[in-house]
Structures are given as C-alpha cells and as structure tokens.
Interface confidence: low
C-alpha cells in the first residue's frame, strides 16, 4: 500500500483532489492546453496531437531533410538549409532530424554574413601588399603592406610579403635597390673592389702631389751658407683645384640605384622608404 | 589574351558519344575566380547552356542534359572536356566553351571559344 | 527552370534608330540578367551584365535597365555594325542558365 505525505493527511489535500484548480504553469518539458499539461514532443519529432484527459501527446519523427532542434509543440517540421551551390555554398555538416544544415563556402569563397547565406571571392593582396591572415570559410584575406626589406610583386591571396634577397650572403652587392613590389637586383663584387680600389690611388696620387710641391717649393729657397736663423712653421697652400682641398665638413660616398650618392655626415646611411620606392 | 579553343570530331554517329575539349590560353584555369563551362548552338536556333565545371572538380550540369553530360577540368593541361552520351541529330549544334564568371558563381558567360561544328549523322 | 521571353523576336530598324528590346522572367531575377550579341557564324558577345553594368570595351550607346522581371536592352544610335542577333540569360536561379530565344535586329 502505499503510503501517503503527511500533508495528504489534512483536509487541504482532500479538497484539492475533490476540486482540482487548473494549472497556471507546467513541469519542464511539458505545455498547457485546454488547462492540462501535455508532454511537448522530443527534438527530431513534430506533433500530431495534444493530449487529453485519457491519452498522451502524439508526436511522429520529422522526414527526410527535415529537422526539429528544441522540445516542442510544432505541427511542422523545419526544412533543412539548402547550401546553394549558385551562392557559392556547400554542406559543411549534414542536417539530422534534431539538426540544421551547415553550410560553408567553396573553396576561395567566404561567407557574406554570420548566417552564411552567400559568398563572396576572397579578396588579393596587390603587389606591394602581402597576405597577413589567409581568408577562411567565413572571413576574407587581410593585407599588409610589406615593410622595408619585404617585397611582393603578385596579386594574390596566400602569398606573404617577400624578404629581400641577401646579396651578401651570396658574395655579391646590391647593383639595384629594392622596393615593395621589388627585389634588391645583386651583381658581381667588381664594382665594390673599383669602389675601394679608386680612391686609394687617388690617395696615392694625392700624396706624390703634395711631395711634389713640397720639393718645388724648397727648391725655389736661396742657398744661404749663413748660419739659418730659427725657422717659423711654413704654411703651405694648396692649389685650390686639387682634389680634396674643399675644407667642409667630411662626407661619406654610399651607392643608390648604381648612383654614388653623397652622404651628409650626422645623417645615418639609410636609405628611406621613399627613395627606396 | 585569354583565349579559347575547342576541338573535337565534327561527325559523331547515333548513340555514340560525343567528346570535345577546349583548350585555354593567355590564364592559368587554377584558380577560384572562374567555371568553365560549355554552351551549343542548333542550327538557326538559339543558346542552350549544357553545364560547367570548376577547377577543384565540383560540376553543374543542366537537368535537360543531366543524365548524359560529364565536365572534366584538368589544370595541368589548361584544358576542360565535354562528353556528351547516347548522341542523337538533335544533338546536332555548334558547340562553344566558355569562360564563366560571378555573379552568381556560374553567371555570365563573358569569353568564349570561336564553336565547333558538331553534326550526328549516321 | 525560369524561362526567359525576348520581344520582338525580330525587328528592322534604320542606322541612327533608337531601338529596345524586352526580356521578361517567368520569376523575379532581381538584377541577375546579362545581354549578348551575336553576329553570324561568330560566337556571342556579352554587352551588359548584371542588367546594367557595361562590359569592357563596349560603345556607351548600348544600355540596359530593369530588375525584377522586365530588362530592356537599349541602342540610342544604331550603327551598321550592331545588325545582330540579341539574348538575354538570367544568372539568378542556376543550373541551368537560361537564354531568351533571342531577337534579330535587321537593317530596314
């Protein structure tokens, strides 16, 4: 037998089995209808009808390509997401009866929106651009502009910017500068043996010329056999057309684009972002 | 330039099957932007598109032809094919390629081959 | 399949006419419509695509509106060289890409 709660014991428990009030709100997982609780129908599943007095509620599965995700009183069934090929979509997941489709982008597509109902192409990073995050099924390709040291020269959307090659490493100098779309152009050493090579016969030259003069000079003097008075210091005077007697202050010769350049000294020798494009 | 060439036998005998391939030049076909697809002509008659194919494989034929028609695009040749099944003589058209660009992924046919000339007769 | 519906199916006109051709979806296309020009024995040439826009390369005196169901191709100038065969193919709801039956415009 069995056995009552205490509280079905008081008259309050009786009267309420004698007049029962009708439901205000239902259990979890149930619905009230013609003031009764019905049992909602289980995902997968759509109602056919409510239930009474004397039977339970009458659900039947969804069909084919249909879908209900939720504990519900539906008398339909959802259609499942059609992934349209002509929007550029395909089946990322296949729908189930208690599930939706899910739909992606084809290949080098992106969706348009969260929803993922079109797509559009990925977007290229132009030249001088390169490609910081490859575009995914739902975002497009982000860009970067390729710093310095970086080149790219294509228009596409997986390829990163470029380092410059290294010349050096390659026993070579760099005969052309490059630029965002650009590699630096190498070329053989010769240029930078000329560039060494130069200015010390200059120098040797330069030198020979200052003795040459020197001599000149002393030998210009008077042969004096009297005893020679304590000489000053003797200033000598360049002529002003030699190489090297500019007085300013010193300067530094790089290359640029197989063009010396002058360097101004306090300046450091780099080359800028704009005269590098 | 981009430039399409089909070719193929211009006579094909009934229930036999009818191969063409066009072949692109002046583009590379590897990539995501464009389908390749194929279009006839009957004589003295107007435009019926047969279907396309991408450069990852996917197709899109026309339901008219379904049944009948495979696309193929091989990216390392530059080329796409067209096989035609169970021809009969009103399969008798000028058949064209063409390239096939957004909107709406297989929208409008914008260069296209000069056609080819495709007669079934026994 | 939407079916598309060209009228006139052909037409004469004189060099300097203003000519339009209809097309007509059997469903809202939106603006999904592309024009083309096909002379004989040539393959078809696209003119206008996306009902208004204008291919590369072609004279500014061919023009297209509509969106929905009703398109018009229009030629404010006609010029011996646009003596052709016109379709329109809508874009919208494929496979299958369809074309109109087309419309032959003859000189008069």
């Known amino acids: 037998m069995v056995r009552l709660p205490l509280q079905c014991v008081l008259w309050g428990c009786l009267l309420t089995a004698v007049h029962p009030e009708p439901p205000t709100a239902c259990r979890e997982k149930q619905y009230l209808i013609n003031s009764q609780c019905c049992s909602l129908c289980q995902p997968g599943q759509k109602l056919v009808s409510d239930c009474t007095e004397f039977t339970e509620t009458e659900c039947l599965p969804c069909g084919e390509s249909e879908f209900l995700d939720t504990w519900n009183r539906e008398t339909h069934c959802h259609q499942h997401k059609y992934c349209d090929p002509n929007l550029g979509l395909r089946v990322q997941q296949k729908g189930t009866s208690e599930t939706d489709t899910i739909c992606t982008c084809e290949e080098g597509w992106h969706c348009t929106s969260e929803a993922c109902e079109s797509c559009v192409l990925h977007r290229s990073c132009s030249p001088g651009f390169g490609v910081k995050q490859i575009a995914t099924g739902v975002s497009d390709t982000i860009c970067e502009p390729c710093p310095v040291g970086f080149f790219s020269n294509v228009s596409s959307a997986f390829e990163k910017c470029h380092p410059w090659t290294s010349c050096e490493t390659k026993d070579l100098v760099v005969q052309q500068a490059g630029t965002n779309k650009t590699d630096v152009v190498c070329g053989p050493q010769d240029r930078l043996r000329a560039l060494v090579v130069i200015p010390i016969i200059f120098g040797i030259l330069f030198a020979i010329l200052l003795v040459l003069v020197f001599i000149k000079k002393v030998a210009k003097k008077p042969t004096n056999k009297a005893p020679h008075p304590k000489q000053e210091p003797q200033e000598i005077n360049f002529p002003d057309d030699l190489p090297g007697s500019n007085t300013a202050a010193p300067v530094q010769e790089t290359l640029h684009g197989c063009q010396p350049v002058t360097q101004e000294d306090g300046k450091e020798s780099r080359i800028s972002v704009q005269e590098r494009q | 330039q981009l430039q399409l060439q089909e070719s193929g036998p211009g006579l094909v005998r009934p229930s036999e099957t009818l191969s063409l391939t066009c072949s692109v030049s002046g583009a590379s076909m590897n990539t995501n932007n464009y389908y390749w697809g194929w279009i006839r002509q009957p004589p003295g008659k107007g435009l019926e598109w047969i279907g396309s194919g991408y450069y990852n494989g996917n197709t899109y034929y026309n339901p008219s032809l379904k049944s009948r028609v495979t696309i193929s695009v091989d990216t390392s040749k530059n080329q796409f094919s067209l096989k035609l099944n169970s021809v009969t003589a009103a399969d008798t058209a000028v058949y064209y390629c063409?390239?096939?660009?957004?909107?709406?992924?297989?929208?409008?046919?914008?260069?296209w081959g000069q056609g080819t000339m495709v007669t079934v007769s026994s | 399949d939407i079916q598309m519906t060209q009228s006139p199916s052909s037409l004469s006109a004189s060099v300097g006419d203003r000519v339009t051709i209809t097309c007509r979806a059997s469903?809202?296309?939106?603006?999904?419509l592309n024009w083309y020009q096909q002379k004989p024995g040539k393959a078809p040439k696209l003119l206008i695509y996306a009902a208004s826009s204008l291919q590369s390369g072609v004279p500014s005196r061919f023009s297209g509106s509509g969106s929905g169901t009703d398109f018009t191709l229009t030629i404010s100038s006609l010029q011996p060289e646009d003596f052709a065969t016109y379709y329109c193919q809508q874009s919208y709801s494929t496979p299958p890409i369809t074309f109109g039956q087309g419309t032959r415009l003859e000189i008069k």
């Open positions: 469903q809202s296309i939106s603006s999904y």
């Open positions: 063409a390239r096939q660009t957004p909107p709406r992924i297989i929208g409008s046919p914008n260069i």
